[in-house]
């Protein structure tokens, strides 16, 4: 008997497991800079981190997770969106670099946003037309009476036992799926060696199935993304984020689950389920 249905069942199981684990994943935050990402020396810049409603801490990370700034001054931009603003009043060369956002929405931390590269250049006489991710201005803009600068926020903690079991379970299912696929491929090879397939359809169908699975997964991932969140108030001074100046930018993939080097505030148990990190680098022209 052909293992065709078995392989399909394996794929369906795999798919169901993946979608199940994605069920409670948080949407990635977005990051933008105002007035842009190319800033004259001495001018101000505001990083805007946006995420879903209910975010309690937004973190702006610079270059690596060891340099970050937290704010709990989160504004509700709309019934389904929240944002925080991190302002640098007087940009120095040391502020140039890669920035990204991450947020804490109980009981867990989100993935990081894409990187945004801040370029600092010498002030020139003429007006700038900086490369920027345009922000949609929606609703009244109020200024808060204080710019709280919160140093620490709860860091992602180690895996709890139950999460370890889930992880092992997912791994086992994944390996089982791989094994099924390998066996299926071997079986197909044997069939090919033994003689030509009975019909064209029979040859094509197995190759189409994985694509279908990938397509469903991609659409699931798309649905979890929140984009184009409007702007609102709250700004936090981020001058503490200024680190050593660097002429060249090194793109490094950072471990999302590594503990930060700062002392992190104790927090009640939270889900620390690892997730595949898809890093997109913001391509910005140097002037």
């Amino acid at each position: 008997m052909s293992p065709h249905p078995t392989a399909l069942l394996g794929l369906v199981l795999c798919l169901a497991q993946t979608i199940h684990t994605q069920e409670e994943d948080l949407p990635r935050p977005s990051i933008s800079a105002e007035p842009g990402t190319v800033i004259p020396l001495g001018s101000h810049v505001t990083f805007v981190c946006r995420g879903p409603v209910g975010v309690q801490t937004f973190r702006l990370e610079r270059d690596s997770r060891s340099t970050y700034n937290d704010t709990e001054d989160v504004s509700q931009a709309s019934p389904s969106e929240s944002e925080a603003r991190f302002r640098i009043d007087s940009v120095r060369e040391g502020n140039a670099g890669l920035y990204r956002c991450i947020y804490y929405k109980p009981p867990k931390w989100s993935e990081q946003s894409d990187y945004l590269e801040l370029l600092v250049k010498e002030s020139s006489g003429g007006p700038d037309s900086p490369d920027t991710e345009p922000g949609s201005s929606a609703g009244p803009t109020q200024r808060p009476s204080d710019n709280s600068h919160n140093e620490h926020a709860p860091a992602s903690q180690g895996l709890k036992a139950e999460h370890l079991y889930i992880l092992i379970g997912v791994s086992v299912v994944f390996l089982f799926c791989l094994l099924l696929l390998v066996l299926f491929c071997l079986h197909r090879q044997n069939q090919i060696k033994q003689g030509p397939p009975r019909s064209k359809d029979e040859e094509q169908k197995p190759q189409q199935r994985p694509d279908l699975a990938v397509d469903v997964l991609e659409r699931t991932a798309d649905k979890a993304t929140v984009n184009g969140l409007p702007e609102k108030d709250r700004e936090t001074d981020t001058s503490a984020l200024a680190a050593g100046s660097s002429q060249e930018v090194t793109y490094a993939q950072l471990d999302h689950w590594a503990l930060t080097q700062r002392t992190a505030r104790a927090v009640s148990p939270q889900s620390t389920k690892p997730m595949a990190e898809s890093i997109t680098y913001a391509a910005v022209a140097r002037h």
């Epitope: 801490t57 709990e72 509700q76 109980p106 505030r265 889900s271």
Partner: antibody, heavy 121, light 109 residues
Framework: EQSLEESGGDLVKPGASLTLTCKAS?????????MCWVRQAPGKGLEWIAC????????TYFASWAKGRFTISKTSSITVTLQMTSLTAADTATYFC?????????????WGPGTLVTISS | ELVLTQTPAPVSAAVGDTVTIKCQAS??????LAWYQQKPGQPPKLLIY???TLASGVPPRFKGSRSGTEYTLTISDLECADAATYFC???????????FGGGTEVEIK
Amino acid sequence: EQSLEESGGDLVKPGASLTLTCKASGFSFSSSEFMCWVRQAPGKGLEWIACIYGGLSDDTYFASWAKGRFTISKTSSITVTLQMTSLTAADTATYFCARSCDVNYYGFDPWGPGTLVTISS
Amino acid sequence: ELVLTQTPAPVSAAVGDTVTIKCQASQNKGTNLAWYQQKPGQPPKLLIYLSSTLASGVPPRFKGSRSGTEYTLTISDLECADAATYFCQSTYYGSNGLTFGGGTEVEIK
């Protein structure tokens, strides 16, 4: 309409244990909320006890004074319980169940009417 | 641990007056506040969350604001139905916990 109702309040002796139950109507627990317990001693203020995450994981949050003696758990997608042990007269209060939802930035809404727990010998 | 201190203790005002209740947070972390109204024999009712956002169905006579670590609930055009005890609460799931203030009773003259 979304509502909550507590049950299990009783008159018990010091040192006894008691389990309170909160049942949701009009909604079931989801990954965007927490189910919480708050108590209020007669003529006193509100005192937060504990919360449990409504999603797949069972993340729990406790007031520092409540750790150890109190246990919060989800028994179904619409019920949450609060187990209390080694009860003393100081635990005499009306116990409220409330939902803490991200849409209200985790403000507690709705609340149940409360169930009275009296500890007396 | 976060401590929320509410002042004044009891407030007495006439119908049509404006009443201001303050809630002072002991630290500037995780202190986005919610305000509740509680009448005798009833559970509390959410009025304001995220320090200044009105909860559904709450009249705009109730206004929340923040200045540093001081949070204010202002009730304008006071009505008889506003006679109640008002509580502030930190709605942060971090180490501060979900602390409540001691409560402020508002009575109508």
